[in-house]
Interface confidence: low
């Protein structure tokens, strides 16, 4: 449906508040280094312009595309060249190329200072003084640090952020009320950002077909009572929404997401019995709730899959007539019967089925050739099951911190060329799979664990893509989206790696470590552990454990000392010498 003025259309659909918030997010995700005030000024100018178009859609420039309008506005930033370097060259391009150019310069790891949380009273004062600016600043700070954050979902986070301050700044104990809520929002926000980053990477690197396959599998698990045609419609609409958001078309994305939520709620009888509560909520909560809704119960009378996909004489005929539709039906039927499988496993099974049909439908006796295809699935199912069992046992034995350390050692030995901060961040997140998923019963462990690992390994892939240093990482990241985890699992110690020169400075610590939070102290120790492995990749678990135990004792001792700095200097030298001796450095 063509509109005379796209900007007026979106302003009217979304309303002024959401329009302004989404434009701010879009601009902050493109120009990640610009000061807050500059972005607010740009957003206000765009909003005023949009209002003139609402009043008169045929007014000058109102017929321009959103990319043209937003791009023209971004290119008015005076400091573009000095702040962004070559990104300024985007502005010399005409619109078809310009937006593309901005997208290519999005930075997953921008050089921005860590967000430090002020004192609760300071935050509450700022909130009361100017609520609108306070909330805009939240959107801005999150969006610039997470340039692929799912914009309509960020509006939902901002709504919760506002609710937390509204409630807690009036409470008797403001800190006790507010801090847990902010911690929860921070952790959920990081998880949401990483999940969306995988969706964008899947569209960007592997194409629409890969994303649609993922969506068919996930929605079929979630809505097993829905017909295939219904699931297909939802998949098509969901793909459009995510393609738009990943491409920076945030107004269209938010608008289409609202339409999709509306459609789902109007048709919940033919989709899922679990949607009733979600559909009674306001828009932002509704969309979030639908995205997180639990799997519906499987229909009781589902027939065996073998009849249609193995025993039928028409398998090759049906496959040849419409390959992707037939494979989509296979994936739908398999996924709705297996909420206990990860989405990536279901996609591996579908790929195996596709490969078998490609080979067998060209054979002399196709049926004879593909008759045993389901037997090929057994090892594919058992591999993640065994891996999860082993790792959950290890997690239960070690606890989260030491489990993370085991993974740090494992992954540093696999890909020692990767930067230490990336190895620490990724291994810590991999280690969180234990507390996140091992508590679940068997039937929920695999979808929890393996699909979470896909999200974390994608973080490694996008960070590595910015500065590629390891052919092995590139290979695992680019060859197959669904086989990334098995690819990394299969990597052994990199025998080609030349150990890093020993540098005592890396292992020099100061009294400031004593004032760090437990989490930050862990990160310091884990950074040292990665560096140790990079110096001595053949060190045994026992050797590394001994050094890390000594290190923990050293920190504890010096943090209790009267003259902490002297203790760190003197005891630190002894620790380095002892560690060198223990590891044969």
């Amino acid at each position: 449906d063509a509109h005379k003025s796209e900007v007026a259309h979106r302003f009217k659909d979304l309303g002024e508040e959401n329009f302004k918030a989404l434009v701010l997010i879009a601009f902050a995700q493109y120009l990640q280094q610009c000061p807050f005030e500059d972005h607010v000024k740009l957003v206000n100018e765009v909003t005023e312009f949009a209002k003139t178009c609402v009043a008169d859609e045929s007014a000058e420039n109102c017929d321009k595309s959103l990319h043209t309008l937003f791009g023209d506005k971004l290119c008015t930033v005076a400091t573009l060249r000095e702040t962004y370097g070559e990104m300024a060259d985007c502005c010399a391009k005409q619109e078809p190329e310009r937006n593309e150019c901005f997208l290519q310069h999005k930075d997953d790891n921008p050089n921005l200072p860590r967000l430090v949380r002020p004192e609760v009273d300071v935050m509450c004062t700022a909130f009361h003084d100017n609520e609108e600016t306070f909330l805009k600043k939240y959107l801005y700070e999150i969006a610039r640090r997470h340039p692929y954050f799912y914009a309509p979902e960020l509006l939902f986070f901002a709504k919760r952020y506002k609710a937390a301050f509204t409630e807690c700044c009036q409470a008797a104990d403001k800190a006790a009320c507010l801090l847990p809520k902010l911690d929860e929002l921070r952790d959920e926000g990081k998880a949401s950002s990483a999940k969306q980053r995988l969706k964008c990477a899947s569209l960007q690197k592997f194409g629409e077909r890969a994303f649609k396959a993922w969506a068919v599998a996930r929605l079929s698990q979630r809505f097993p009572k829905a017909e295939f045609a219904e699931v297909s419609k939802l998949v098509t609409d969901l793909t459009k929404v995510h393609t738009e958001c990943c491409h920076g078309d945030l107004l269209e994305c938010a608008d289409d997401r609202a339409d999709l939520a509306k459609y789902i709620c109007e048709n919940q009888d033919s989709i899922s019995s679990k949607l009733k509560e979600c559909c009674e909520k306001p828009l932002l909560e509704k969309s979030h709730c639908i995205a997180e809704v639990e799997n519906d119960e499987m229909p009781a009378d589902l027939p065996s899959l073998a009849a249609d996909f193995v025993e039928s004489k028409d398998v090759c005929k049906n496959y040849a007539e419409a390959k992707d539709v037939f494979l989509g039906m296979f994936l739908y039927e398999y996924a709705r019967r297996h909420p206990d499988y990860s989405v990536v496993l279901l996609l591996r099974l579908a790929k195996t089925y596709e490969t078998t049909l490609e080979k067998c439908c060209a054979a002399a006796d196709p049926h004879e050739c593909y008759a045993k295809v389901f037997d090929e699935f057994k090892p594919l199912v058992e591999e993640p099951q065994n891996l999860i069992k082993q790792n959950c046992e290890l997690f239960e034995q070690l606890g989260e911190y030491k489990f993370q350390n085991a993974l740090l050692v494992r992954y540093t030995k696999k890909v020692p060329q990767v930067s230490t901060p990336t190895l620490v961040e990724v291994s810590r997140n991999l280690g969180k799979v234990g507390s996140k998923c091992c508590k679940h019963p068997e039937a929920k462990r695999m979808p929890c664990a393996e699909d979470y690992l896909s999200v974390v390994l994608n973080q490694l892939c996008v960070l590595h893509e910015k500065t590629p240093v390891s052919d092995r990482v590139t290979k695992c990241c680019t060859e197959s989206l669904v086989n990334r985890r098995p690819c990394f699992s299969a990597l052994e110690v990199d025998e080609t790696y030349v150990p890093k020169e020993f540098n005592a400075e890396t292992f020099t610590f100061h009294a400031d470590i004593c004032t760090l939070s437990e989490k930050e102290r862990q990160i310091k120790k884990q950074t040292a552990l990665v560096e140790l492995v990079k110096h001595k990749p053949k060190a045994t678990k026992e050797q590394l454990k001994a050094v890390m135990d000594d290190f923990a004792a050293f920190v504890e001792k010096c943090c209790k000392a009267d003259d902490k700095e002297t203790c760190f200097a003197e005891e630190g030298k002894k620790l380095v010498a002892a560690s060198q001796a223990a590891l044969g450095l």
Epitope: A2, E6, S65, H67, P96, N99, E100, R209, C246, H247
Partner: nanobody, 116 residues
Framework: EVQLVESGGGLVQPGGSLRLSCAAS????????LAWYRQAPGKQRDLVAR???????YYADSVKGRFTISRDNSKNTLYLQMNSLRAEDTAVYYC??????????WGQGTLVTVSS
């Protein structure tokens, strides 16, 4: 990642019409904007017309009212209907695709000659 092949160019008299086609293949799912550019001998390449995925169009002033750009998404094809052709429309016409995820793509060009 997106390949483009133009066709339909040729010799035409002033006042005549031509219809150019551009067939896209490869990662066509990722295309958002399609456009026609042209380059006359010794001149730079200029935008003639473009059409967004939503169907909104833009025309250079020199072709407004004479040329019509359209796209058939089901056939992955872009068209340029050129009426009331003039000698100054003589140029190599290039098809252009702006993709969501891949570098911009250009066709190899098709020559349009307007002469009596």
């Amino acid at each position: 990642e997106v390949q483009l092949v133009e066709s339909g160019g040729g010799l035409v008299q002033p006042g005549g019409s031509l219809r150019l086609s551009c067939a896209a293949s490869g990662s066509t799912w990722s295309i958002n904007t399609l456009a026609w550019y042209r380059q006359a001998p010794g001149k730079q390449r200029d935008l003639v017309a473009r059409i967004s995925s939503g169907g909104s169009t833009y025309y250079a002033d020199s072709v407004k009212g004479r040329f019509t750009i359209s796209r058939d998404n089901s056939k992955n094809t872009l068209y340029l209907q050129m009426n009331s052709l003039r000698a100054e429309d003589t140029a190599v016409y290039y098809c252009y695709a702006q993709s969501t995820w891949y570098p911009p793509s250009w066709g190899q060009g098709t020559l349009v000659t307007v002469s009596s």
